[in-house]
């Protein structure tokens, strides 16, 4: 269980409408409640069944919420972050960071600045380039036969 765990990191803008049971998710984190080591960011800890977030389907447990209605969530006390969500109004815009594990190993989150959180384009671009080079080399080889 000690193998390196890499992540594809993607960001998404999620617009939620506060439903009859609210936004329908819980959060952890903050400068006074670091839930992820070396990271005081705000993370989704639970999504309520049939709540607004669950019905929308895009927000996932473990997602990091970067901003609410354009307001950055960096360096906030936990309760201040909670109050921000509770007072965000009827239409709520969330900037969210998803992290998808791309290699077998223990599931977890990396802190900010951890080099193993790899943006998706940094994985896909080299793969695409290698594929193109291999195809070109194969065609040249066939021509020489």
């Amino acid at each position: 269980m000690n193998g390196r765990v890499d992540y594809l990191v993607t960001e998404e803008e999620i617009n939620l409408t506060r439903g009859p049971s609210g936004l329908g998710f819980n959060i952890v984190g903050g400068t006074d409640q670091q839930y992820v080591s070396n990271d005081s960011g705000i993370y989704v800890s639970r999504i309520k069944e049939n709540g607004a977030a669950a019905l929308d389907g895009r927000l996932q447990e473990g997602d990091k919420i970067l901003s609410v209605n354009g307001q950055d969530l960096k360096n906030l006390l936990h309760q201040d972050a909670v109050d921000l969500f509770r007072n965000a109004g009827y239409a709520v815009s969330l900037r969210v960071q998803h992290r998808l594990q791309v290699q077998n190993g223990p599931i977890g989150h990396r802190g900010e600045g951890d080099p193993s959180g790899i943006p998706i384009f940094m994985v896909l671009v080299p793969v695409f380039a290698l594929t193109m080079v291999a195809a070109w080399a194969f065609m040249r080889y066939r021509q020489q036969l």
Epitope: R18, G22, L23, I27, Q33, R46, E49, F85
Partner: nanobody, 127 residues
Framework: QVQLVESGGGLVQAGGSLRLSCAAS????????MGWFRQAPGLERDFVAE????????GYADSVKGRFTISRDNAKNTVYLQMNSLKPQDTAVYYC?????????????????????WGQGTQVTVS
């Protein structure tokens, strides 16, 4: 995984007081929102009160505001419900509940679906 054990229930006369306790076992107790619910015979389990991770944020059902007070001691992994001016309609089984993190909605919205872990309940009877 959190295990919850309630205590402090009993029989009390109208106008009297009781203090319920809920002892939690498991890691990171302070990261949990804790709540109290109650269920009278034949009725749904209703929200009573909840308290945020640090104790700074609390919410109450309208029916108990001004009479009940929820508190927690993270060093003891325990949450309390002080019940004063009890009425016969407060008779019910009282359940302690826990959920990881803080709900992003006010407690006006709270239902039993918002909590994942439950105690076995303690009976409160007001005569």
């Amino acid at each position: 995984q959190v295990q919850l054990v309630e205590s402090g229930g009993g029989l009390v006369q109208a106008g009297g007081s009781l203090r319920l306790s809920c002892a939690a076992s498991g890691p990171t107790f302070s990261s949990y929102t804790m709540g109290w619910f109650r269920q009278a015979p034949g009725l749904e389990r209703d929200f009573v009160a909840e308290i945020g991770w640090s104790g700074g944020s609390t919410g109450y059902a309208d029916s108990v505001k001004g009479r009940f007070t929820i508190s927690r001691d993270n060093a003891k992994n325990t949450v309390y419900l002080q019940m004063n001016s009890l009425k016969p309609q407060d008779t019910a089984v009282y359940y302690c509940a826990a959920v990881i993190g803080s709900p992003t909605d006010y407690s006006d919205y709270r239902s039993s679906l918002d909590y994942d872990y439950w105690g076995q309940g303690t009976q409160v009877t007001v005569s």
